[in-house]
């Protein structure tokens, strides 16, 4: 029962995590204009992995896509790649884990196969989470570097008369969504791997057990009986305990809706 719970919880946590990674990847607010130095600006800039946006105080928001591949910084390309790899691995992991769930019966699939699939999906979730965390961290590092570089030459003046404020960018909401989502996917993956250990077949043979019947003395030879633990190779027809009492977990992935005004 604990194994089923661990596996189910791992799946749900990973599902939430991957939904978060997708949301973070699509979000426009990876970096947002730092308002500390100019809190009275009427124009607010923010940037994502795919486009940059400007929100005017009128509520009018204009977004422009990065319609170039070669002209983009290598780091941004790397972050995009990491996030996409994370999403792809996570999606495959989810697909595999659905079939691996103990509460879902597919034909005569053996528990050893479910254990392997659980481990596979668990590893995929771990790698997916690490990709997301790495991607977000690389972007954050890029922001920190640029922030201090732009602080160093914050004001360029003409005879001290005219100030030109360079726009500095700080961490956007997407970074925090990405970190949390990556962490959740990672935790979900670890939980799946833990659940796999509980699902793995354990060939436990009973040693010589003697039954003393009145009048007769019958001894059962070792190896003549296999424990019906529910994990043995002969449990296909000998189901002692059916863990999943047909509880269909209808897990829905809620697509994150971004309101690009």
């Amino acid at each position: 029962m604990a194994v089923t719970a661990c596996q189910g919880l791992g799946f749900v946590v990973s599902l939430i995590g991957i939904a978060g990674i997708i949301a973070a990847t699509c979000m426009d607010q990876w970096s947002t204009q730092d308002l500390y130095n100019n809190p009275v600006t009427a124009v607010f800039n923010y940037q994502g992995l795919w486009r940059s946006c400007v929100r005017e105080s009128s509520g009018f928001t204009e977004c422009r896509g990065y319609f170039t591949l070669l002209g983009l910084p290598a780091m941004l390309q790397a972050v995009r790649a990491l996030m996409i790899v994370g999403i792809v691995l996570g999606a495959i992991g989810l697909l595999v884990s659905i079939f691996a769930l103990k509460c879902i019966r597919i034909g005569s699939m053996e528990d050893s196969a479910k254990a392997n699939m659980t481990l596979t999906s668990g590893i995929m979730f771990i790698v997916s989470g690490l990709c997301a965390i790495a991607g977000v961290s690389v972007f954050a590092n890029m922001l920190v570097t640029n922030f201090w570089m732009s602080t160093a030459n914050m004001y360029t003046g003409m005879g001290g008369m005219v100030q030109t404020v360079q726009t500095r960018y700080t961490f956007g909401a997407a970074l925090f969504v990405g970190w949390v989502a990556g962490g959740l996917t990672l935790i979900g993956g670890v939980m799946m791997c833990i659940a796999c250990r509980g699902l793995a077949p354990e060939e436990t043979n009973y040693k010589a057990v003697s039954y003393h019947a009145s009048g007769h003395s019958v001894a059962y030879k070792p190896g003549g009986f296999k424990a019906s633990t529910g994990f043995g190779s002969n449990t296909k027809n000998k189901k002692i305990y059916d863990g999943g009492a047909r509880t269909e977990d209808e897990v829905q992935s809620y697509p994150s809706k971004h309101d690009y005004v």
Partner: antibody, heavy 119, light 113 residues
Framework: QVQLVQSGAEVKKPGASVKVSCKAS????????MHWVRQAPGQGLEWIGM????????NYNEKFKSRVTMTVDTSTSTAYMELSSLRSEDTAVYYC????????????WGQGTTVTVSS | DIQMTQSPSSLSASVGDRVTMTCKSS????????????LTWYQQKPGKAPKLLIY???TRESGVPSRFSGSGSGTDFTLTISSLQPEDFATYYC?????????FGGGTKLEIK
Amino acid sequence: QVQLVQSGAEVKKPGASVKVSCKASGYTFTSYWMHWVRQAPGQGLEWIGMIHPNSGSTNYNEKFKSRVTMTVDTSTSTAYMELSSLRSEDTAVYYCARRYYGSISPDYWGQGTTVTVSS
Amino acid sequence: DIQMTQSPSSLSASVGDRVTMTCKSSQSLLNSGNQKNYLTWYQQKPGKAPKLLIYWASTRESGVPSRFSGSGSGTDFTLTISSLQPEDFATYYCQNDYSYPFTFGGGTKLEIK
């Protein structure tokens, strides 16, 4: 068509308050910022602040922050600007102006309300 | 606050003339995010409310004649009227739209010579 109709001229004594109204028509009142700008006789334009009718959020010029209050009545599509502790230098024409959606600039203005502060 | 300085404060010209007036801001009005300059030009006639002519430094408001054009970037901006018409004699104001509080220039009064 878009119209902003302001209340009539006011004569106030120093220290008193004045509340100018601006009735909007011809557009969705709650979708646009409403600005208030004033112009002293023979002087230039001065931005007082703005209010968003939908959220009620305001942004005031620091110069007027302690004395100005902007409100809206969405049921009548009317914006109000109240200026307290009036001084003689507050004598001016007060304009309401609708926020232009494609940019920051107001594109429709009221006809103006003359406020005279005199003892 | 951003200071807006207009020059000249008054200007005499004749119908058909090409007129140029300038506006200088104490801080750059160029937004790096979209490379737009947040400067607006208004026309005001005596006893009337201001009328929007140009926003984003060079974008003409719909219905504004093509003889009006705006240019400039950063801190220096120009409003040009290519061929003056009788109805163009008025006071012109530039406005900072980039930073609160929105500030206006002192105005340039365009008079008939």
